[in-house]
């Protein structure tokens, strides 16, 4: 299920990682498009162990994963994606 995620007027990620995270460890993913006070797109992965990782949007693995999730968005997603809408 795609949902809108709102956040405060600033960036959430101080730094980010390109390290691959297997889907079985991922609880949900937040996509924060550029805007709302942040001059860059951010992707935040919430892991099942309750840790949070900011992922480099240019990392190939997250791009591939997001593409798969987008293609499956008509059905129930194994990994919920939360996307903040920019007005």
């Amino acid at each position: 299920v795609l949902e809108v995620y709102y956040t405060s007027l600033r960036c959430r990620c101080v730094q980010e990682s390109s390290v691959f995270i297997p889907r079985r460890f991922i609880d949900r993913i937040q996509i924060l498009p550029r805007g709302n006070g942040c001059p860059r797109k951010e992707i935040i992965v919430w892991k099942k162990n309750k840790s949070i990782v900011c992922v480099d949007p240019q990392a190939e693995w997250i791009q591939r994963m997001m593409e798969v999730l987008r293609k499956r968005s008509s059905s129930t997603l194994p990994v919920p994606v939360f996307k903040r809408k920019i007005p």
Partner: antibody
Framework: EVQLLESGGGLVQPGGSLRLSCAAS????????MSWVRQAPGKGLEWVSA????????YYADSVKGRFTISRDNSKNTLYLQMNSLRAEDTAVYYC????????????WGQGTLVTVSS | DTQMTQSPSTLSASVGDRVTITCRAS??????LAWYQQKPGKAPKLLIY???SLASGVPSRFSGSGSGTEFTLTISSLQPDDFATYYC?????????FGGGTKLEIK
């Protein structure tokens, strides 16, 4: 090929107004963040303003906030900068830029248009 | 606002030299830094973003490094076409800010 063509610059008196335009082509304009960057004669670069693809998000440098308004017409592939209450320190070449996807980095630049504020 | 300071403001070098330009941020900006090249009377051109990622079409003799508050732009072997003014820019937060520029001139 990405092309950005600014127009509307010229000589204006202090306190006056001017509207700059930037005609864009060669890319999907409505999906792109756009910005204005200026450069005073013999000086460095100064970021002025930015606008999201839909036009719903806008940002300004403190030096122009309340005086300048950035806008866009996606049906015309055109970016605008309405400049009011102009001051001598606004004299500069104004560049229209297209940002890289997802980050506030000017990947493409127009040739610039000169704005001179003088009495 | 995040202040960006470049050094030196002017740099004299010869063709074939290896040159380094430094950019310092007044606060940590991780790797949210871009470098631009500008020639007289022309618009700037993007060289590097995310501190070290080369923009499309930029020669491999240009490289960037650094993280946090200190960044460098290196040209491994100066070519005649490289004599220009170079600017850094942070995009860690708004307002976006540029360094004052480094003019690279022929010795």
């Amino acid at each position: 090929e990405v092309q950005l063509l600014e127009s509307g610059g010229g000589l204006v008196q202090p306190g006056g107004s001017l509207r700059l335009s930037c005609a864009a082509s060669g890319f999907t304009f409505g999906n792109s963040w756009m910005s204005w960057v200026r450069q005073a004669p013999g000086k460095g670069l100064e970021w002025v303003s930015a606008i999201s693809g839909s036009g719903g998000s806008t940002y300004y440098a403190d030096s122009v906030k309340g005086r300048f308004t950035i806008s866009r017409d996606n049906s015309k592939n055109t970016l605008y900068l309405q400049m009011n209450s102009l001051r001598a320190e606004d004299t500069a070449v104004y560049y229209c830029t297209r940002d890289l996807p997802g980050i506030a980095v000017a990947g493409y630049w127009g040739q610039g248009t000169l704005v001179t504020v003088s009495s | 606002d995040t202040q960006m300071t470049q050094s030196p403001s002017t740099l004299s070098a010869s063709v074939g030299d290896r040159v380094t330009i430094t950019c310092r941020a007044s606060e940590g900006i991780y790797h949210w830094l871009a470098w631009y090249q500008q020639k007289p009377g022309k618009a700037p051109k993007l060289l590097i973003y995310k501190a070290s990622s080369l923009a499309s079409g930029v020669p491999s003799r240009f490289s960037g490094s650094g993280s946090g508050t200190e960044f460098t732009l290196t040209i491994s072997s100066l070519q005649p076409d490289d004599f220009a003014t170079y600017y850094c820019q942070q995009y860690s937060n708004y307002p976006l800010t540029f360094g004052g520029g480094t003019k690279l001139e022929i010795k």
